[in-house]
């Protein structure tokens, strides 16, 4: 628990506790917001983001968003609360230890997004089909 000498505060989303009152450590994520990227037609890419930030709220996970349009390719890396949509999409894979890209429907661009919950997991973004969650080995990793 938060020890007695640490004040309790009302309506506090900076602290996440389990049923026993244990405190959750926050996630460490790559956090460069939106940057131009050279990642294209690859099974996986590194983010090339040099900033690893402490997520503001312990419930937040790491997110990466890859977008391609007629003009450029961008990669966005952030922390985000999986209970809230991001770019109008639910973070379905927030419990995954790896950031496995899933395509989302967005008019006028190709849009992939992934989320994950191990330290700096949005540094390595995976597009390859072999990592798809239909793979039973990956499901074992995620739910162990």
């Amino acid at each position: 628990t938060i020890p007695p000498h640490v004040q309790k505060s009302v309506n506090n989303d900076m602290i996440v506790t389990d049923n026993n009152g244990a405190v959750k450590f926050p996630q460490l994520c790559k956090f460069c917001d939106v940057r131009f990227s050279t990642c294209d037609n690859q099974k996986s890419c590194m983010s090339n983001c040099s900033i690893t930030s402490i997520c503001e709220k312990p419930q937040e996970v790491c997110v990466a968003v890859w977008r391609k349009n007629d003009e450029n390719i961008t990669l966005e890396t952030v922390c985000h609360d999986p209970k809230l949509p991001y770019h109008d999409f639910i973070l379905e894979d927030a419990a995954s230890p790896k950031c496995i890209m899933k395509e989302k429907k967005k008019p006028g661009e190709t849009f992939f997004m992934c989320s994950c919950s191990s330290d700096e997991c949005n540094d390595n973004i995976i597009f390859s089909e072999e990592y798809n969650t239909s793979n039973p080995d990956l499901l074992l990793v995620i739910f162990q």
């Epitope: 628990t1 000498h5 026993n20 244990a22 405190v23 959750k24 450590f25």
Partner: nanobody, 124 residues
Framework: EVQLLESGGGLVQPGGSLRLSCAAS???????RMWWVRQAPGKGLEWVS?????????YYARSVDGRFTISRDNSKNTLYLQMNSLRAEDTAVYYC?????????????????WGQGTLVTVSS
Amino acid sequence: EVQLLESGGGLVQPGGSLRLSCAASGFTFTEYRMWWVRQAPGKGLEWVSAIEPIGNRTYYARSVDGRFTISRDNSKNTLYLQMNSLRAEDTAVYYCAKQMPGQKWMAKSRFDYWGQGTLVTVSS
């Protein structure tokens, strides 16, 4: 017995600097990621900075990045936080905390994971 003892807090003017220390004992310091966590009056905990046990890789909250510097001296079992360009919103009690590799939750012990804290007041 595990102990974490913070010191170095005090009253400082906006734009000023302070250096906090956390003396650790009763555990193998070099096995733990160490954190600085703060709590402003009436607010929740804010995770300010962390440093890896070996290699001194560091992490910061966006609110302090570029102003605060975390460091550790493993030979002295001591954690530090150099705070520069202090602002009124940095006023808080600052705690050090320890985290084992891969540990997601902080267990239910008053002194195993937290120090008593040191008060930093930024005011003119």
